[in-house]
């Protein structure tokens, strides 16, 4: 017995017609079961399979192979958080954070907490002390003076 188009099984009473639209993206196997087209999954074959590696938590897709990031996330796989705008020497674990690297401080991690080490401002053998963000003090050897022991 040969079934009519789109009918399958004993008695030809199983219906399956391929679709590729809002309601699903599937073909039909020899038994009339829905088989999702490449790039689609789910019982209704209407959920796209995202780019391999796309973060299941922070990325999604409406088309196969895509990876669209949630607000606050970036990168090819949507696995990198976006730090606070203007964050200079900082990183984030969650969106909009600015966690300062060593020796940096301030809301945007733009304040140097180790000005002495970074800039070595004290001349002529002066001893540098960090006194605050972007602040330092030079202790000058005998015979020298000025903010940087330059005189």
């Amino acid at each position: 017995v040969t079934c009519d188009d789109y009918y399958y099984g004993f008695g030809c009473n199983k219906f399956c017609r391929p679709r590729d639209d809002f309601f699903g993206h599937y073909a039909c196997d020899q038994n009339g079961n829905k088989t999702c087209m490449e790039g689609w999954m789910g019982p209704e074959c209407n959920r796209a399979i995202c780019r391999q590696g796309c973060s299941p938590k922070h990325g999604s897709c409406k088309l196969p192979g895509d990876c669209r990031c949630q607000y606050g996330w970036q990168g090819l796989y949507c696995d990198k958080c976006i730090p606070h705008p203007g964050c200079v020497h900082g990183i984030c674990n969650e969106p909009w954070q600015c966690l300062c690297e060593t020796n940096w401080g301030g809301q945007l991690c733009d304040k140097d907490l180790n000005y002495c080490g970074t800039h070595q401002p004290c001349l002529n053998g002066g001893t540098c002390s960090n006194t605050g963000p972007d602040k330092y003090q030079c202790s000058c050897p005998e015979g020298y003076s000025g903010p940087n022991c330059e005189i």
Partner: antibody, heavy 116, light 107 residues
Framework: QVQLVQSGAELKKPGASVKVSCKVS????????IHWIRQAPGQGLEWMGI????????KYNQKFKDRVTMTVDKSTSTAYMELSSLRSEDTAVYYC?????????WGQGTLVTVSS | DIQMTQSPSSLSASVGDRVTITCRTS??????LTWYQQKPGKAPKLLIY???TLASGVPSRFSGSGSGTDFTLTISSLQPEDFATYYC?????????FGGGTKLEIK
């Protein structure tokens, strides 16, 4: 077991809006679309629209297009249907149903009465 | 929109009778057709999907046939619990529409 539990009856004035909820359990919420169907007293069934619960995309019956909004909250496995600018002819029982080769599962229905 | 014409709109029959309800569509919907049974105050119940597939738990006295534009729901031997209203619905394209219903009453 699969269950769709809808919010309680509503009495609304003409011009107001109503938002009906449909909380599902017993299966993965985002695996199946949710449809909304209504039935006026003593009348037949009328399909209002469908929402893809994974993406939140909706397709509406043109008759309701400008007045209906379907949404989902994946965190609570709940679908919502909001109908605005209500008029007396919107008095009906509103059903949600799980879509896939026919509606095997329905909510219990929510009666919305529109009266001044 | 696809129009669904269901007939008859009402029908009187007796227990044990064979009953046929028809549904005609305004264009080819292949087999994207569903039949429901509804009792007063209750949500509809799925009987048949894809024109002829019996839904889980539905008695075998119910059967569906047809494809394209002409469809039939048959109850081979009416039981007392079968007196209800029956609806056809297509799920081919948006909007999915229902037939007007057939009220099956006891003669």
């Amino acid at each position: 077991q699969v269950q769709l539990v809808q919010s309680g009856a509503e009495l609304k004035k003409p011009g107001a809006s109503v938002k009906v909820s449909c909380k599902v359990s017993g299966y993965a919420f985002t695996d199946y679309a949710i449809h909304w169907i209504r039935q006026a007293p003593g009348q037949g069934l009328e399909w209002m629209g469908i929402i893809n619960t994974y993406y939140g995309d909706s397709k509406y019956n043109q008759k309701f297009k400008d007045r209906v909004t379907m949404t989902v909250d994946k965190s609570t496995s709940t679908a919502y249907m909001e109908l605005s600018s209500l008029r007396s002819e919107d008095t009906a029982v509103y059903y949600c149903a799980r879509g896939y080769d026919g509606f095997a599962y329905w909510g219990q229905g929510t009666l919305v009465t529109v009266s001044s | 929109d696809i129009q669904m014409t269901q007939s008859p709109s009402s029908l009187s029959a007796s227990v044990g009778d064979r009953v046929t309800i028809t549904c005609r569509t305004s264009e080819n919907i292949y087999s994207y057709l569903t039949w429901y049974q509804q009792k007063p105050g209750k949500a509809p119940k799925l009987l048949i999907y894809n024109a002829k597939t019996l839904a889980s738990g539905v008695p075998s006295r119910f059967s569906g046939s047809g494809s394209g534009t002409d469809f039939t729901l048959t109850i081979s031997s009416l039981q007392p619990e079968d007196f209800a209203t029956y609806y056809c619905q297509h799920h081919y394209d948006i909007p999915w529409t229902f037939g007007g219903g057939t009220k099956l009453e006891i003669k």
